[in-house]
């Protein structure tokens, strides 16, 4: 209620002869603050005095007169809150009833506090969970309700009296709730822990034993066992027996039920301590245990590999990769169930023995067409040698071979026929599906492998086919040496280099692009007229009159060919002049008179002069010289000049006579 | 029958490419599992192996020289080449280039050789 | 890789005597092993192939012989033009030749 002052503190404090006590304490006054202390050992009121009595432990007054015991005992409180105290050292008498009497001003207060001082230090306490489990973590708890400042002690855990390794967590408590020291130890015990003693170990600074709390564990496990075989090494051979014992060498609690498995399924009707196997067959080669149950579960013993040794059984053959790629690599693996392994491998490739092939493994680095087939291998060891089993198949793919374009026409091949060709290989695998041919063309494919080529062409020259699987293999290409007429027959001015005048060396060349077969023969013709049989045409003078259109012809063995026609142009000077004249060489005055130069000329004249019986020049320039009206005077000789590129020509002299008209006739 | 002839510039500069050509007659390097390599003697020395190209223009390399060596073929004019580059005084030797016929399995051996070329690295 | 290990480095005989020039494997070669004459100053020869095959045009005097790891090279008799220097090779090793057994006139 409010009239009481409110103190914490722990109820009893426990400690041990020449150790110390630490007392945490809180309080709170009624009113003001505390001005007397005094700590009682056992106080008793008395009723007389309305005093206590006891021995006075610890005195703090106004007047500041303090007890020797003053030195042992300290109050380390205040004047309105904390109220804690030491005793150091502490001693067996100091057992009983603290009393703290506190003052204030106007009010007074007996607080009571437990103190069991023991003679040696009493031991820690062992706390273990309810239940312990193999390899299941527990803590461990020592706890000893003492802490004090001026009296360090440590807790020290032990398995069989020699200490533990694991890491102990230790934490103290000196607080107004509770005074104690903890340690804790977390732990994972094994089944090889069950009955062991664990001690929890109080000791002092210095680590000298003061005492100790000890427990018995009690680890429950599956059962713990043991297997022995007969013969020790689990190794025999077909035919043999075998003796397998299982024993319990713990087992908490007690087991119940027993069996035995073989590569963990079990055996049935198997439930005795003992398993014998008579007349063993490879098939019972496997890891054997026993098995033991208790209430915390199933036991299993290690496992015994039995041997059941044997002769290779007929062998398989595993290919890594199969169908492979010219030029790849295969792996071969022989596999083949025997104990002990084999030790020893013959391999054969369709029936023969491959020679130096004496492990599981054959790798063939680059595969070869003719490494395709069948390939068995047989496998030893010390019971004997395996029988060769069925063997594998080695498919072996690559491109066709040996692609050949064969003609088959008869030869030579002309322009214009119609060519067969085929295309051949010598193998492949897989089978050929389709064929390729080079250059392409508008041919047709009457059946797989054959092309026809209609109207051959001249310039056909090389024909390459290529037969295709999942690969293409091209052959060589083949010519088709395709015969033809002359081709691109030409006449070509050899001399001279410029125009070709009259009287020139004049030069024709037969020309041809190509023929096939290569031996020719030549014709030159004019106007239809063999001219000659050489491949040139020679003029050592060219005159006008050889002038003209000229064609030469080129023939093989397959034909002939004409060349375009071609003009052969004479350039001269002009020639055969003559004056010819109109309406005749006698004209009546006062009429007209046309002159006409004429001339033969190329290229054609291109200025014309006229001269009169004087051999004076006139001055007309054109081919025709016109005189109207024409007079009397005009009587006389003319003659023209004709001049072109190439020259001038003259025309010998033509005598014109003008006579008198009958009028002018009249006059005279 | 099989001839193999090898042919090279006969002396180089250091740090310059070696180019070396094969030129062979009597087989083809078409023909499935047949090979050729090219092996080196160092005066005095014993035979080194270079390089090798089969028939399928798959090839092999000594592993020390892998990274200056190159080798090709031209079957249809039936030559194979070696390029080295960055040679250096050490690549002084007889050049020799050998053919290996298709095997029966995997056992590729030279059954006909080259006379040799010399090379020459001046530094 | 395998590595091949010629013995011995050189080898003195007198003529007429038999001599055996050995090649060890650090594995398994299945007989894929070839010996090689080589002349001084000439190209190397073909002697055996696949082990114990003779080469044609080999005189009989020359034998090889071996299996798995290892293999030799016998000559009886020598003769004076079976002098120069000997060399096992397998293809598949690295390096492909071994060191090489020079035989000198004793």
């Known amino acids: 209620d409010s009239s009481k002052w409110v103190f914490e503190h722990p109820e009893t404090l426990y400690a041990w002869e020449g150790a110390c006590v630490w007392i945490p304490c809180t309080y709170r006054a009624l009113d003001g603050d505390l001005e007397s202390f005094i700590l009682f050992h056992n106080p008793e009121y008395n009723k007389n005095t309305s005093k206590f009595d006891g021995t006075r432990l610890y005195e703090s007054t106004k007047d500041g007169k303090v007890p020797s015991e003053q030195k042992r005992v300290q109050f380390l409180g205040d004047k309105n809150k904390n109220c804690t105290l030491s005793i150091h050292p502490v001693h067996l008498n100091d057992s009983g009833q603290l009393g703290l009497r506190m003052e204030s001003k106007t009010e007074k207060w007996m607080e009571r506090i437990h103190l069991n001082v023991s003679e040696r230090p009493f031991p820690p306490h062992i706390q273990l969970p309810p239940e312990i489990q193999e390899s299941q973590e527990v803590t461990l708890t020592c706890l000893l309700n003492f802490s004090c400042y001026g009296y360090p002690i440590q807790l020290q855990w032990l398995l069989e009296g020699v200490p533990m390794r694991q890491a102990a967590v230790t934490s103290t408590s000196l607080t107004i709730k509770s005074v104690f020291t903890r340690s804790e130890l977390k732990f994972s015990p094994q089944w090889s822990h069950h009955g062991k003693i664990v001690t929890c170990q109080l000791q002092d600074a210095d680590g000298k034993f003061l005492s100790n709390d000890t427990v018995q564990l009690n680890v429950k496990h599956t059962p713990k066992l043991e297997i022995k075989v007969t013969p020790s090494d689990a190794i025999v051979r077909e035919g043999d027996s075998v003796t397998m014992t299982c024993e319990v060498s713990s087992s908490n609690p007690e087991y119940t039920t027993v069996s035995w498995l073989k590569d963990g399924t079990s055996l049935k009707k198997q439930n005795t301590f003992t398993l014998n196997l008579r007349e063993v067959t490879k098939d019972q080669s496997g890891k054997y245990c026993c098995q033991v149950s208790n209430d915390v579960g199933p036991g299993r013993s290690e496992e015994v590999f039995l041997q059941v040794q044997y002769a290779p059984e007929p062998s398989t053959v595993q290919i890594l990769h199969s169908p492979a790629v010219e030029g790849s690599q295969v792996e071969f693996l022989c596999m083949s169930l025997a104990n002990p392994l084999p030790t020893n491998y013959t391999w054969y490739h369709n029936g023969k023995e491959m020679q130096g092939r004496t492990e599981e493994k054959v790798h063939i680095p680059k595969i070869l067409p003719w490494h395709a087939g069948t390939y068995s291998c047989v496998a030893e060891n010390i019971l004997g040698t395996g029988q060769r089993g069925p063997g594998a198949e080695l498919d072996v793919q690559y491109p066709p071979k040996k692609v050949t374009t064969v003609i088959q026409n008869p030869m030579p091949i002309r322009e214009g026929d119609t060519v067969t060709l085929s295309c051949n290989y010598n193998s492949s695998n897989p089978s050929v599906t389709r064929y390729e041919w080079k250059p392409h063309g508008a041919w047709e494919e009457p059946s797989l492998g054959v092309l026809k080529i209609q109207n051959v062409g001249w310039d056909n020259t090389t024909i390459a086919c290529a037969a295709c699987n999942s690969w293409c293999s091209w052959a060589s290409p083949v010519a088709l040496n395709v015969q033809y007429a002359p081709r691109d027959v030409r006449v070509r001015k050899i001399k001279p280099l410029s125009e070709i005048h009259s009287g020139n060396s004049v030069s024709l060349q037969c020309d041809f692009s190509s023929s096939h077969p290569k031996e020719v023969q030549f014709f030159w013709e004019k106007n239809g007229r063999l001219l000659g049989k050489e491949s040139q045409l020679n003029f050592d003078s060219i005159s006008p009159e050889d002038a003209g259109s000229y064609s030469c012809w080129v023939n093989n063995s397959i034909g002939q060919t004409a060349s375009k026609a071609w003009t052969l142009e004479v350039l001269y000077a002009p020639r055969r002049l003559r004056v010819s004249m109109s309406p005749g060489d006698q004209v009546m005055e006062g009429k007209s008179a046309t002159l006409t130069c004429e001339s033969d000329a190329n290229p054609p004249v291109s200025h014309y002069t006229w001269f009169d019986w004087n051999n004076q020049s006139l001055p007309y320039h054109s081919q025709k010289l016109r005189l109207e009206p024409v007079k009397v005077q005009h009587s006389g000789a003319y003659w023209c000049q004709g001049t072109n590129s190439v020259g001038k020509g003259r025309s010998p002299l033509s005598t014109l006579t003008v006579y008198y008209s009958p009028e002018t006739i009249g006059r005279r | 029958q099989v001839t193999l002839k090898e042919s090279g510039p006969g002396i180089l500069q250091s740090s310059q490419t070696l180019s070396l050509t094969c030129s062979f007659s009597?087989?083809?390097?078409?023909?499935?599992?047949?090979?050729v390599s090219w092996i080196r003697q160092p005066s005095g020395k014993g035979l080194e192996w270079l390089a090798h190209?089969?028939?399928?223009?798959?090839?092999r390399y000594n592993p020390s020289l892998k990274s200056r060596l190159t080798i090709s073929k031209d079957t249809s004019r039936n030559q194979v080449f070696l390029k080295i580059t960055s040679v250096d005084t050490a690549d002084t030797a007889t050049y020799y280039c050998a053919r290996a016929p298709p095997p029966n399995w995997d056992e590729y051996y030279f059954d006909y050789w080259g006379q040799g070329t010399t090379l020459t690295v001046s530094s | 890789d395998i590595q091949m290990t010629q013995s011995p480095a050189s080898l003195s005989a007198s003529v007429g005597e038999t001599v055996t020039i050995t090649c060890r494997a650090s594995g398994n070669i299945h007989n894929s092993l070839a010996w090689y004459q080589q002349k001084q100053g000439k190209s190397p020869q073909l002697l055996v192939h696949?082990?114990?095959t003779l080469a044609d045009g080999v005189p009989s005097r020359f034998s090889g012989s071996g299996s798995g790891t290892q293999y030799s090279l016998k000559i009886n008799s020598l003769q004076p033009e079976d002098f120069g220097s000997y060399y096992c090779q397998h293809f598949w090793s690295t390096p492909p030749f071994g060191g090489g057994t020079k035989l000198e006139i004793k």
């Open positions: 696949n082990a114990k």
């Open positions: 009597g087989f083809s390097l078409s023909t499935s599992g047949m090979g």
């Open positions: 190209i089969y028939w399928d223009d798959d090839k």
